[in-house]
């Protein structure tokens, strides 16, 4: 892989330990927490990133802010089990033997159970809706300019193929970015929409995962875009299996097929 040879760091993942002990003395980087080798020419999987984040000592986790804990059921931040490819294992369990099934972006898609809970397959999240509210700006944003800039961002910064950015909607001050990627559409080497969405989510919270880069500076014809609030909805190829109590009781649901993380930005 192409980690920077001169100082042996991973441009796409600061949560790594790198050393020149690869084949032929090449720089090799391993994710914190899992120790898995990562490809520094592309995004690291969300599972490995979450694992790295949870492995950091509590007092060293300077990126975590109180808003992190405003996630429904506190499911957004946990120490996941990842498979050898770095993907989420379909079943996740905590230290007290409470288990649940997750989708490909690691979001819980069933009620919590015990060790007897079966999760037959990792269900793919094929549609992600990123809902943003931007701060009032001195100059208005033109929809087509905003669309072009966000598509450029996902293509250049997150290396997501343009065909997976399905749409950008804008009704001031709300911006919606739709990412779509079916199993059949995702070719080898394609960045996963779940990973791109996670990098974007961290970027807009000022917690960039990229090595040595400053905060994300997003401009539309020179006018900076600042994000006040983010809401991310995940739609799975197979509907989730929650009890009726959860679906009707005002839990996290934005409809039975949606999971959402609710983050506040101040």
């Amino acid at each position: 892989h192409t980690a920077a040879q001169d100082n042996c760091t991973c441009p796409t993942n600061k949560m790594t330990v790198c050393s020149p002990d690869g084949p032929g003395g090449r720089c090799q980087c391993r994710a914190l927490g899992s120790g898995m080798a990562v490809d520094c020419s592309t995004l690291t999987s969300k599972c490995l990133l979450l694992k790295a984040r949870m492995s950091a000592p509590k007092n060293a986790r300077t990126l975590v802010r109180p808003s992190e804990h405003a996630l429904v059921d506190n499911d957004g931040l946990y120490d996941p089990d990842c498979d050898p490819e770095g993907r989420f294992k379909a079943r996740q369990c905590n230290q007290t033997s409470v288990c649940w099934c997750v989708n490909s972006v690691g979001v819980r898609r069933t009620d919590k159970g015990d060790l007897s809970l079966r999760c037959d397959e990792l269900v793919r999240t094929h549609h992600i809706l990123i809902d943003l509210r931007h701060r009032p700006t001195a100059g208005a944003f033109n929809h087509s300019d905003l669309d072009a800039e966000l598509r450029r961002l996902f293509r250049e910064r997150y290396r997501l193929h343009p065909k997976f950015v399905a749409a950008v909607h804008y009704e001031q001050p709300t911006i919606q970015i739709e990412l779509r990627q079916n199993t059949s559409q995702k070719a080898a080497g394609d960045v996963d929409i779940g990973d791109a969405a996670y990098y974007f989510e961290r970027d807009i919270k000022g917690e960039s995962l990229f090595q040595g880069r400053g905060g994300l500076d997003l401009r539309v014809r020179g006018e900076p875009l600042q994000v006040e609030r983010t809401l991310i909805y995940y739609l799975d190829e197979i509907p989730p299996k929650f009890s009726m109590k959860r679906l009707t009781g005002g839990g996290s649901g934005g409809g039975s097929h949606h999971h959402h993380h609710h983050h506040h930005h101040h």
């Epitope: 401009r219 994000v227 930005h265």
Partner: antibody, heavy 122, light 106 residues
Framework: QVQLVQSGAEVKKPGASVKVSCKAS????????INWVRQRPGQGLEWMGW????????KYNEKFKGRVTMTVDTSTSTVYMELSSLRSEDTAVYYC???????????????WGQGTLVTVSS | EIVLTQSPATLSLSPGERATLSCSAS?????IYWYQRKPGQAPRLLIY???NLASGIPARFSGSGSGTDYTLTISSLEPEDFAVYYC?????????FGQGTKVEIK
């Protein structure tokens, strides 16, 4: 450290033009816009406009539209502000200032250049 | 255009005293920025986004407010704090500054 260095003082006749330069260093030049602000003797601060070096986008104060032109030379990390049809009321200290912004915050104008005194006198 | 009115125009205080500077906007703004200017020097950013301290600025400076009324407070004046202070808005074009408050030694 981030630094903006401006060109020296100028004396101009009414009706002439002046071009002030602002050379940036210590940061990625294309990542922040450069604003121009002037201060007339005994007056407050007056914003003239900004230019964003990455794509050349600019925004001018309507008050100066038609008289002000901001340009950028990315090869030398320099921004220029040209003011034409000068009159005595344009006698002022002209400052360039960097505005750093991310998706999280607008961090204001910081730092400022040392200022360039432009005197318009017949 | 949004007009920012600063008060008082001049504030005469002694070192160690608390200084409270006001900035009133002609229409609601979301954030205010504060700058300090000393004679013969360029302005210096003190506060961004209403209440955040700029890099290298001492903690005795603080900002607050919302809507149309904003305040810069210097908890205990140091000799180097005697200067002119300006507020600025980034809510709508043209960007505007207040006319300034001069903090002078009593």
């Amino acid at each position: 450290q981030v630094q903006l260095v401006q060109s020296g003082a100028e004396v101009k006749k009414p009706g002439a033009s002046v071009k002030v330069s602002c050379k940036a260093s210590g940061y990625t030049f294309t990542s922040s816009d450069i604003n121009w602000v002037r201060q007339r003797p005994g007056q407050g601060l007056e914003w003239m406009g900004w230019i964003y070096p990455r794509d050349g986008s600019k925004k001018y104060n309507e008050k100066f539209k038609g008289r002000v032109t901001m340009t950028v030379d990315t090869s030398t990390s320099t921004v220029y502000m040209e003011l034409s049809s000068l009159r005595s009321e344009d006698t002022a200290v002209y400052y360039c200032a960097r505005r750093f912004a991310t998706v999280v915050s607008n961090y204001g104008l910081d730092p400022w250049g040392q200022g360039t005194l432009v005197t318009v006198s017949s | 255009e949004i007009v920012l009115t600063q008060s008082p125009a001049t504030l005469s205080l002694s070192p160690g005293e608390r200084a409270t500077l006001s900035c009133s906007a002609s229409s609601s703004v979301n954030y205010i920025y504060w700058y300090q200017r000393k004679p013969g020097q360029a302005p210096r950013l003190l506060i961004y986004d209403t209440s955040n301290l700029a890099s290298g600025i001492p903690a005795r400076f603080s900002g607050s407010g919302s809507g149309t009324d904003y305040t810069l407070t210097i908890s205990s004046l140091e000799p180097e704090d005697f200067a002119v202070y300006y507020c600025q808005q980034w809510n709508s074009y043209p960007l505007t500054f207040g006319q300034g408050t001069k903090v002078e030694i009593k």
